[in-house]
């Protein structure tokens, strides 16, 4: 291929005309197409939905599109021994049985196959005692429970309910509690939104509704049978008692009708203060267990879920680069769901489809990307990230030599009031640019830029003017790619204005009422939503493959890196006595980051100076930003975590959906004072401060001057 | 020379209130979070509370919370702590401290004495 062949057809076939080929119309009809039956991870219908996307995608014009399968560890109900929680009398008579299924939705009642409410990986129990309600079942929860209230949940079935944090933080932090199993249920205070109705008439929680989901702690480890390593053909895999992640005391998710049942019999301990009270007419007490009339009675769980080796599918399309086939820009998002998957994921897999349908139009007139384009259909997404962190450890080699970013599309909309962003630093620019060429589709809006309303909407805490752009936590398929293997990553989607419920995702969230009507219906009927998603990401894609030189900017890193430490340096400062006495300095780290900040200035001014037409002087600079984000990386990894590698940048110890900053110096310092060997914890915090600042000032040395 | 020089403090009635004043010279700290810190007689350095850059976001030992307001004023380069309600358990010696936008170590002030006594 000649050097040229690209930028040749790219005046014809550039940026506009990709984005002008992006349809709406067409998003639904894949929506509609990818949401008619379940496609759970694992199953027939998912194997023949990939089949369909290879087939669709090589119609596109794709160069190639192949089937990548892995043998991993999933979960699944027992079809003839149904999961369900009792409230049970003296004489152990069940007088209370939580409900087997969800009421389908209208027109689903006769479809097959759709899976019981369930927690993934939950192991096999019966566990009966007294309940105590946890509130969110977060560390701050935990810290009230048991040093303010000195309430003991050793023994006792836990209920929480679901929001702020992951679900698999709560049952961790249930099982260091010393719980033997846990219920958690959707409140209406975080799943029901007010003054909107129930679905089917509207897009909140019923009763009867219920939120699936994993409960795996597997920090980033991929198939909880084989980490660090594909699952192919030949793996070794571990014994369930070795496997990464798994929880070891049963778990079962409920809807707000049965936890009424559970929640209004509590007695013991008032509700420290209004935020352990939710909006279910029942006192919240936390117990342990049930008020006078009914202490005899206990909660039992019946728990028969389980965990199967089973093949799963990605479709991994290519669309080679005609300039630089060797680097790889990817857009990936996954296709299992728990159900009908009408937000997640389908509401992203179409919109992947028709980024796929753009872009092979284009191919089919004669242009190609100047780098390659990968594009990804993961699967078993919901069961812990396992599609793409096999193919990311299959292909970890290629990856860290060839990745340039890595976009990811899952559900396009948690609402439709604004965009939102998470993404690295090094992509802060590229997306302003870009959102500034965008339409807005916002009401009151017309005729203003995607820009415009989203700064107006969401604005920066810190930059007045620009709009707010959130650091990547985990929770998704980027994890791999970022986390461990250090490939500039971003997403982007439509969402809430409920800045407070961050993290409890939309009320139909891995319900059997996310279906296409929802979305058609209540939050994107125009699908216009849909649409500047697809642009935003698309235009991303399309952005990082075919530009000259790569949209990145070290300088926004930069900025980030002073006010990161500053604020880790906040949090030490909170013990001022026991820096004084351990000689606990962050000067190495400060002068790290002054020292980045002027690399980079200077590498800035080298990037708009050099010679573009010189091919290997542009690779070197390209090089030297794409290598950037990859210098972050340690490859030891954060303590106990070896798959999040990430030196600025991890999932929150608290919270997997949520990112922390200098995570290796933040959990050194968190709850320090608690800790029985106060020399050895600060011990462990200089340990941490030296880490990132060599960290950081190695990865300014990458910007410098390479000779 | 850079430096912070704290003032404002004195002898007060308990329940009385009192606001120190931070004044920043050769020094430019708007780039970065300011913090409180004191000294009881006899006793270890105790965190009172932090301003972040913007001014936005503010945290306070739980003793102190309802009771302090940290505030600044980035034009003067002036960081302030209003403290009512005054306990006898609030005497110590006040320090601020912060860091240049262009320094790589911390700067603390000398500090300003504040005695609660009836």
């Known amino acids: 291929k000649s050097s040229n062949e690209a930028t040749n057809i790219t005046p014809k076939h550039n940026m506009k005309a990709f984005l002008d080929e992006l349809k709406a119309e067409n998003i639904k009809k894949f929506l509609y197409n990818f949401t008619q039956i379940p496609h759970l991870a694992g199953t027939e219908q998912n194997f023949q939905l990939a089949k369909q996307i290879q087939s669709q995608w090589k119609e596109f014009g794709l160069d190639s599109v192949e089937l990548a399968h892995y043998d991993v560890l999933l979960s699944y109900p027992n079809k003839t021994h149904p999961n369900y929680i009792s409230i049970i009398n003296e004489d152990g008579n069940e007088i209370f049985n939580t409900s087997l299924f969800e009421p389908p939705p209208p027109g689903y009642e006769n479809v097959s196959d759709i899976v019981p409410p369930f927690s993934a990986f939950s192991p096999q129990g019966m566990p009966e005692g007294d309940l105590v309600y946890v509130n969110y079942a977060r560390t701050e929860d935990f810290f009230k429970l048991e040093r303010d209230m000195k309430i003991n949940c050793s023994g006792k079935i836990v209920i929480a309910r679901y929001g702020k944090v992951f679900r698999g933080n709560k049952v961790k932090n249930a099982q260091l509690a010393g719980a033997k199993g846990v219920i958690l249920y959707s409140d209406p205070a975080d799943y029901f939104a007010p003054g909107v109705k129930s679905y089917p008439d509207g897009w909140n929680l019923p009763g009867g509704g219920v939120q699936r989901g994993n409960i795996l702690n597997l920090n980033g480890a991929g198939d909880p049978l084989t980490p660090g390593y594909p699952a192919n053909e030949y793996a070794y895999r571990r014994g369930i008692a070795e496997a990464v992640g798994l929880p070891s005391i049963p778990v079962h998710p409920i809807g707000y009708y049965d936890a009424q049942k559970l929640l209004e019999k509590m007695g013991g301990s008032a509700p420290p203060d209004s935020s352990w009270r939710g909006s279910l007419k029942v006192p919240y007490n936390v117990g342990p267990g049930f008020t006078g009339n009914f202490s005899t009675q206990k909660v039992k769980m019946h728990i028969h879920s389980t965990n199967e080796v089973t093949r799963i599918y990605n479709v991994i399309g290519t669309l080679r680069g005609a300039v630089e086939p060797d680097r790889y820009v990817i857009l990936g998002g996954h296709r299992d769901s728990w159900v009908f998957g009408g937000i997640d994921p389908q509401s992203g897999a179409a919109v992947v489809h028709e980024i796929v349908r753009s872009f092979g139009t284009l191919k089919k007139e004669g242009w190609r990307p100047r780098r390659t384009i990968l594009f990804a259909s993961w699967d078993a997404e919901e069961f812990g990230l396992l599609g793409s962190t096999e193919w990311a450890e299959e292909n970890s080699r290629l990856l860290q030599e060839r990745g340039v970013a890595y976009i990811n599309a899952d559900s396009s909309i948690e609402g439709n009031y604004t965009l939102r962003v998470d993404c690295t630093p090094l992509m802060y620019s590229l997306v302003h640019n870009l959102t500034k060429e965008l339409k807005s589709p916002d009401e009151g809006f017309e005729g203003k830029s995607l820009y415009e309303s989203w700064t107006k909407k969401s604005p920066s805490p810190e930059f007045s003017g620009m709009p707010r752009i959130s650091k990547l936590g985990s929770g998704n398929d980027f994890e791999v790619f970022f986390q461990r293997l250090g490939i500039a990553s971003g997403r982007a989607r439509y969402t809430k204005n409920w800045e407070t419920n961050k993290f409890s995702g939309y009320p139909l969230y891995h319900s059997v009422y996310e279906t296409y009507e929802l979305v058609e219906k209540f939050y994107d009927p125009m699908f216009k939503y849909h649409l500047t998603v697809a642009q935003v990401r698309g235009g991303m894609v399309f952005e990082l493959a075919n530009s000259i030189v790569l949209p990145f900017d070290c300088r926004d890193y930069a900025v980030v890196l002073r006010k990161y430490a500053d604020k880790i340096y906040s949090i030490s400062m909170k013990h001022p006595q026991e820096m004084k006495t351990y000689s606990v300095s962050f000067d190495s780290l400060f002068s790290a980051v002054k020292n980045f900040t002027e690399i980079a200035s200077k590498f800035s001014e080298r990037l708009q100076d050099f010679d573009k037409s010189n091919p290997i002087v542009l690779r070197m600079m390209n090089d030297q930003l794409m290598f950037l984000e990859r210098a972050f990386i340690d490859p030891l990894g954060l303590p106990d975590r070896p798959f999040y590698r990430h030196v600025i940048y991890a999932p929150s110890s608290h919270n997997k959906y949520a990112g922390e900053s200098f995570p290796g110096i933040y959990d050194a310092l968190f709850d320090i004072e608690s800790k029985v060997d106060p020399s050895k914890a600060w011990g462990e915090v200089k340990r941490q401060i030296y880490v990132a600042a060599f960290t950081v000032q190695a990865a300014a040395e990458t910007l410098s001057e390479v000779a | 020379e850079v430096q912070l020089v704290e003032s404002g403090g004195g002898v007060v009635q308990p329940g009385r209130s009192l606001r120190l004043s931070c004044a920043a010279s050769g020094f430019t700290f708007s780039s970065y979070a300011m913090h409180w810190v004191r000294q009881a007689p006899g006793k270890g350095l105790e965190w009172v509370a932090t301003?972040?850059?913007?001014?936005?976001?503010?945290e306070y030992v739980d003793s102190v919370k309802g009771r302090f307001t940290v505030s600044r004023d980035d034009a003067k380069n002036t960081l302030y702590l209003q403290m009512d309600s005054l306990r006898a358990e609030d005497t110590a010696t006040y320090y601020c401290?912060?860091?240049?936008?262009?320094?790589?170590?911390?700067?603390w002030g000398l500090g300003t004495l504040v005695t609660v006594s009836s």
């Open positions: 401290v912060g860091r240049d936008s262009t320094s790589i170590t911390p700067v």
């Open positions: 301003i972040y850059q913007d001014g936005s976001e503010s």
